[in-house]
């Protein structure tokens, strides 16, 4: 899957664009908004009717090296009495993000962009029921 | 940056940390090409905290299209199909990395950017306090 070139007619490629070898692109990994602190809703993962846990995955050859993945705690959903209701389903909600992968080939190093699917949390859904003959 | 293990037979000139700027292959390594959440599942309709998906498009960014979730209700849908306002539909937010064209309009020069997206909604039981 290639990154699309700027194909819009209103874009004129500026003279200031850096020279880039064919088949590659220049990527600055100093992250824009790196220090922007976001106010996430506190412990929704515990108060949700489809609660989840977090696991941190670590890979030193990936940037960022730390990626947090959620896992639904239950198959069913938690009802008003605090009991699991298996007539409903806890399902994962996923989102793609980009990472930079470093690859070692002998003593040379190359970099590759990669799409990673992150499970961000869970939601409670009504299952679609099929009766098998 | 982050440190990585290095092949002991390689020259010491290699930096252990990720450099600030790298040259990256234009092909994205990726097995999950379906970026439209409406096609990937219908959870947004079947959830007890359903949401609508709004298309956010920016040609200066990769991916240029990002889908943002907005919870349909303040409360959650109960077993009777009605909204129960003693519960909350709450967006699940996630910081993701995207590419921003830098300098602007350049075809093959990017910078990583962190953005906050609402991916879906979940139903939450709030702790109730009565204010004196």
């Amino acid at each position: 899957r290639k990154i699309p070139k700027v194909g819009h007619t209103f874009f004129q490629k500026p003279e200031s664009c850096p020279p880039v070898p064919g088949g590659s692109m220049k990527l600055d990994i100093g992250i824009i908004n790196e220090n922007q602190r976001v106010s996430m809703s506190r412990n929704i993962e515990s108060r949700s009717t489809s609660p989840w846990n977090y696991t941190v995955t670590w890979d030193p050859n990936r940037y960022p090296s730390e990626v947090v993945q959620a896992q639904c705690r239950n198959l069913g959903c938690i009802n008003a009495q605090g009991k699991e209701d298996i007539s409903m389903n806890s399902v994962p909600i996923q989102q793609e993000t980009l990472v930079v992968r470093r690859k070692h080939q002998g003593c040379s190093v190359s970099f590759q962009l990669e799409k990673v699917l992150v499970t961000v949390g869970c939601t409670c859904v009504t299952p679609v029921i099929h009766h098998v003959q | 940056g982050i440190t990585i293990p290095r092949n002991p037979g390689c020259p010491n000139s290699e930096d252990k940390n990720f450099p600030r700027t790298v040259m990256v292959n234009l092909n994205i390594h990726n097995r999950n090409t379906n970026t439209n959440p409406k096609r990937s599942s219908d959870y947004y309709n079947r959830s007890t905290s359903p949401w609508n998906l709004h298309r956010n498009e920016d040609p200066e960014r990769y991916p240029s299209v990002i889908w943002e979730a907005k919870c349909r209700h303040l409360g959650c849908i109960n077993a009777d199909g009605n909204v129960d306002y003693h519960m909350n539909s709450v967006p699940i937010q996630q910081e993701i990395l995207v590419l921003r064209r830098e300098p602007p309009h350049c075809p093959n020069s990017f910078r990583l950017e962190k953005i906050l997206v609402s991916v879906g909604c979940t139903c939450v039981t709030p702790i109730v306090h009565h204010v004196a």
């Epitope: - | 907005k70 909350n88 709030p126 109730v128 306090h129």
Partner: nanobody, 116 residues
């Protein structure tokens, strides 16, 4: 701690209008939604109207739709309920509710009486 100050209740005749307001102070950050419930004598507490803080999306109970309007003032952390064409069945104690997603604060309530 969060404080909620409700005002604007009172006695009116059918067809009249009233405007309730509720101001939040203290640690009222990360607001999810702000709104009103009501409880009539001998009845259960019911949702009236709510406004989502992030995008001003509003929701109303069917019984008040078209007659009541909820609005907000972000800078003052205040929500308003404009009640028009009041009916005797709107008589109730109106409770302000401040929702912070995982925590919800209820005000003490303000009495609205509609009678001829």
């Amino acid at each position: 701690e969060v404080q909620l100050v409700e005002s604007g209740g009172g006695s009116v005749q059918p067809g009249d209008s009233l405007r309730l307001s509720c101001a939040a102070s203290g640690r009222a950050n990360s607001i999810n939604w702000f709104g009103w419930f009501r409880q009539a004598p001998g009845k259960e507490r019911e949702f009236v109207a709510g406004i989502r803080w992030s995008d001003a999306y509003t929701e109303y109970a069917n019984s008040v739709k078209g007659r009541f309007t909820i609005s907000r003032d972000n800078s003052k952390n205040t929500v308003y309920l404009q009640m028009d064409s009041l009916r005797p069945e709107d008589t109730a104690v109106y409770y302000c509710v401040l929702d912070l997603s995982t925590v919800r604060y209820w005000g003490q309530g303000t009495l609205v009486t509609v009678s001829s």
